[in-house]
């Protein structure tokens, strides 16, 4: 398969910082038109799920062979289907990615499903914002099956597929009726060409046996391995926080791979990277598990641990998947060939030996490189090792050097040295730097040159209002990435700090100096004027206004538009939240009111001048009911409706607009538009025979009018004929061009 | 700094009239809309009324209209409430309140307390 | 006109432990324009009443991020992730859809 990693970094509480990443580990990839072949592409879906246009996707070439999306402005931008495209002639391989919004209505349980052919695949859908209606099914957009609001089970809206196909394959999505699409669950279907295990295209041969939930390809056969894993069966783990089919790429940012989402070519699809699982890939593994996902199960043996990224680690004299085949059992076991800490931190130290006689808490020793004695403070017993727990006075520099672990029992001695590297945290020798200031925030350039060790693991930026008492605001930053204090006070001055950390406990440094950065925030002074409007139905007005031309940028954030029904001592107002933006559409309104309108620039939370109010008038609401409406049955499937034009009306007709309902049915009406509104007959076809129904219509000009009278009528039984002139009924049919 | 003043509260018999002013500084007081909204002893908030930045619409809570009037004087940049036909039930302290694009009451004065008792 | 129901009426908290107050509105305040038109206010002992959240989950200036506002339609949520002594008092959410409706009020005061 083709090495290809699609990464999503889904720290969803600021769009902002929302990134996608696609990585190859293909030679040459991604370097255009010289002979490696095509570039990488990572581009947005829009074709199944489309979300409202807004500002361009900044797209970013990082060296040859990655490319990275930035620019998500809010999170509706998220929502959807990313691709990533790689790879050379028949290799080319395209990487999706759904992305569903975390404050949907339904949230999938699990997004990517790869099931083989002829299996069942079960969509499971979970109420997240419970609405009381129905739930439509899509595949690829298109309808394809609705549940009842009440058919949730446990909470959950499934959709079972059986004896599924390749054609099945696709993007499904769970979505309440009426509700924003963008409020979907999203789910993506991966249908394998064979059967479980085996490849090839009649599929005649068997796969290689993919372990660590690696997933075979049904084309080649090949295993493509779930991120952290690698070899022909994913039978190694990659060290932790590595990724791609040599572990080759490393996560980016300073907690390795949490909060990733790494797809990988079909069938494989999406998941967290090793030891890490939940929605949002935040959570690391519960103990016992380990893995893409956390979906393997350690089971080790003899000692053995396990470790969320690789699995069991097994002690010195064990090893195998479960820890399971034995070794020749060297006494002191496991023990790091170097240690780091960090100064001024009492760790704990850990050495574990067996052996027989079997050692015992006073038989385990730890000696410093300044020769001074370490006795364990506990020790564990277990039947394969006894493991001593010793608690380290208060490091200093001078603890540097190589360390002894020793044990002795009747049966002899056996001891292990190590490397303690004692580590200064560091320190900022200097304030961060302000990059850039808006009214509400500041970009800030956090990493100084600073005294004591790297690396640096983390940024702490500080920040309060100038002499405010108040506790600090603390921001974690990515060492290497500019940082924006967001949601500031206009025209505010903010003392901001930086603290830097390295990894390991204690690995907090002291507070660099701080230093003043000022918001800006002018008053908007541009008074707009209302170039027009215009009415779009008796309760939709559309506005349009304009700015002065001034030199330089424009100082406003957006446009408040206030609407006020002086007869009722009512207003509306409406906030635009573009500068950019002219026009508005304004909707439920009332009919036949006289408005006064006007709008203002607002920046920050100042507002400019009003423009000078304009007065709108709505026309009234639609035409009168259509008069004397009169059903009659003309088979067992039709029944003709006839009646008067209404009286008094404002306008022509544009179309009539015909309800339809079983008499005591609990289901939502039938409507059916009649395009020429010079009629007044027309025939209902398709329904069900011996059956009451109840109809009732109305007219509609600009908007729609009242309702008519409701009419009650039966269909004729099975076999039975209309009496009447079936000649003329058929007549008017052909008329009405339905 | 935005500053709201609140003035011309005190005892009052039922029937009476009061006028309240509210002094507004810090800002360009013609381009807000300005309330009032009171709070009788131990009960909570109730808005009173509402007036445009031009002085243009204005409007009362039910229990007021026709009795109180609001208008402003955008060269003084003061905002009043003239309160005739006083009753008990409208005891209270006043506070006038500035509105911003996102919300009616984003900047209170402190308050006036209006008695009204015989 | 639109009704707005807090509960609970009163709250006990200690301090450093996270707090709730929950808002109803009985009809929805989620305007077409994606905003919900609610804010919430706190009056402390003794003071006038101070702006905490716009628009639903905006905080004001000033406000500590301890704060959050969250809900859509007709069912809102204060949070206060840690609370500190300094915010006793009542917490009051409105409407702004149409004309301005307070809730009763929410009392929280250090147990």
């Known amino acids: 398969a083709v090495d290809l990693t699609l990464l999503a970094n889904l720290r969803l509480t600021d769009p902002q910082r929302f990134f996608l990443t696609c990585v190859s580990g293909e030679a040459g990839a991604g370097r255009g038109s010289d002979a490696w072949g095509p570039p990488l592409l990572l581009e947005k879906d829009d074709r199944i799920v489309r979300t409202p246009p807004g500002p361009p996707l900044r797209l970013a070439r990082n060296g040859s062979h990655q490319v990275t999306l930035r620019g998500f402005s809010k999170p509706s931008d998220l929502v959807g289907v990313f691709s990533c495209v790689g790879g050379a002639g028949a290799r080319r391989t395209r990487v999706i990615y759904v992305h569903n919004s975390p404050g949907a209505h339904l949230l999938p349980d699990k997004v990517t499903h790869t099931v083989n052919k002829g299996d069942t695949a079960v969509l499971s859908a979970r109420v997240h914002k419970e609405k009381q209606t129905d739930v439509i099914w899509k595949s690829n957009g298109s309808y394809f099956y609705t549940l009842d609001w009440h058919e949730a089970q446990d909470g959950r809206f499934l959709l079972q597929l059986p004896n599924v196909q390749p054609p099945s394959s696709g993007i499904y999505s769970a979505t309440y009726l009426e509700a924003s699409p963008l409020g979907s669950a999203f789910f993506r279907l991966i249908v394998r060409g064979c059967g479980a295990g085996r490849w090839g295209p009649g599929c005649t041969k068997e796969c290689p046996g993919c372990l660590h939930g690696g997933v075979c390809h049904d084309h080649d056969g090949e295993c493509v391995c779930p991120p952290g894993f690698t070899g022909t069966r994913c039978e190694q783990a990659c060290r932790e926080g590595r990724f791609g089919q040599s572990c080759q790429e490393q996560c980016p940012g300073i907690s390795g791979c949490r909060g990733l989402t790494f797809c990988l070519p079909d069938p494989y699809g999406c998941s967290c990277g090793s030891g890490w699982r939940g929605s949002q890939c935040q959570e690391a593994c519960a103990p016992g598990h380990f893995g893409a996902d956390c979906r393997l199960q350690c089971q080790c043996q003899n000692g053995g641990t396990c470790d969320r990224f690789s699995g069991c680690v097994c002690p010195s004299g064990w090893h195998g998947v479960h820890c399971e085949k034995s070794d020749r059992i060297p006494q002191i076991l496991n023990m790091a060939s170097e240690l780091e800490f960090n100064l001024e931190t009492m760790p704990r130290i850990n050495c574990a030996a067996a052996g027989n006689p079997f050692p015992v808490r006073g038989s385990i020793e730890l000696r410093k490189p300044d020769g001074t004695v370490l006795l364990s403070t506990k020790a564990i017993v277990e039947p394969e090792k006894t493991t001593a727990e010793f608690e380290v006075p208060r490091l200093v520099l001078a603890d540097s050097g190589f360390w002894e672990c020793r044990v002795s029992t009747s049966g002899g001695q056996d001891s292990r040295r190590f490397k303690v590297n004692v580590k200064v945290p560091p320190v900022p020798l200097a304030a961060p730097r302000l990059l850039t200031k808006q009214s509400r925030q500041l970009v800030v350039s956090p990493l100084v040159s600073f005294s004591g060790d790297g690396p640096i693991s983390t940024v702490r930026l500080h920040y309060r209002p100038q002499d405010s008492t108040m506790d600090w605001s603390t921001i974690v930053v990515d060492p290497s990435e500019n940082v924006t204090l967001m949601n500031l006070r206009p025209k505010t001055g903010y003392s901001v700090r930086v603290q830097l950390s390295r990894p390991g406990e204690g690995g907090e440094g002291a507070w660099g100096p701080p230093t003043l950065m000022t918001t800006d925030c002018p008053e908007p002074l541009l008074q707009p004027w209302l170039e027009g409007w215009h009415v779009e139905g008796t309760d939709r007005l559309r506005v349009s206004w304009s700015l002065p031309l001034v030199p330089g940028p424009l100082v406003g954030d957006g446009f408040l538009l206030r609407l006020w029904d002086g007869t009722r001592g009512q207003e509306r107002r409406e906030n635009v939240s573009s500068p950019q933006a002219r026009t508005a559409l304004l909707t439920g309104l009332t009919p036949g009111t006289h408005y006064q309108l006007d709008v203002q620039l607002y920046h920050c939370t100042l507002l400019g001048p009003a423009s000078p109010p304009a007065h709108v008038l709505l026309p009234p609401s639609g035409p009168p009911a259509p008069r004397h409406l009169h059903a009659q049955a003309l088979s067992d499937s039709e029944i003709q409706l006839t009646w008067k034009h209404p009286e008094a009306l404002p306008g022509p007709i544009s179309k009539y607009v015909v309800e339809v309902q079983v008499a005591g049915g609990a289901g939502d009406p039938l409507w059916i538009d009649v395009d020429r509104p010079e009629e007044t007959s027309t025939i209902i076809r398709g329904l069900n025979a011996s059956t009451r129904y109840l109809f009732r219509m109305r007219a509609s000009i600009q908007g729609l009018g009242d309702w008519s009278n409701t009419v009650e009528e039966s269909t004729l039984g099975n076999g039975l004929q209309a009496e009447g002139p079936v000649q003329e009924s058929r007549a008017a049919e052909e008329g009405l061009d339905q | 700094e935005v500053q709201l003043l609140e003035s011309g509260g005190g005892l009052v018999q039922p029937g009476g009239s009061l006028r309240l002013s509210c002094a507004a500084s810090?800002?360009?007081?013609?381009?807000?809309?300005m309330s009032w909204v009171r709070q009788a002893p131990g009960k909570g908030l109730e808005w009173v009324s509402y007036i445009y930045p031009s002085g243009g619409p204005t409007y009362y809570a039910d229990s007021v209209k026709g009795r109180f009037t609001i208008s402003r004087d955008n060269s003084k940049n003061t905002l009043y409430l003239q309160m005739n036909s006083l009753r008990a039930e409208d005891t209270a302290v006043y506070y006038c309140?500035?509105?911003?694009?996102?919300?009616?009451?984003?900047?209170w004065g402190q308050g006036t307390t209006v008695t009204v008792s015989s | 006109d639109i009704q707005m129901t807090q509960s609970p009426l009163s709250l006990p908290v200690t301090p450093g432990e996270p707090a709730s107050i929950s808002c109803r509105s009985s009809?929805?305040?989620?305007?077409?324009?994606?905003?919900?038109?609610l804010d919430w206010y706190l009056q402390k002992p003794g003071q006038s009443p101070q702006l905490l959240i716009y628009?639903?989950?905006n905080r004001a200036s000033g406000v500590p991020d301890r704060f959050s506002g969250s809900g859509s339609g007709t069912d809102f949520t204060l949070k206060i992730s840690r609370v500190e002594a300094e915010d006793v008092g009542v917490y009051y959410c409105?409407?702004?859809?149409?004309?301005?409706?307070f809730g009763q009020g929410t009392k929280v005061e250090i147990k």
């Open positions: 409105m409407q702004a859809l149409q004309t301005p409706q």
């Open positions: 009809q929805s305040l989620l305007h077409s324009n994606g905003y919900n038109y």
């Open positions: 309140a500035r509105g911003d694009w996102a919300s009616r009451f984003a900047t």
């Open positions: 628009l639903g989950s």
């Open positions: 810090g800002f360009t007081f013609s381009h807000y809309d």
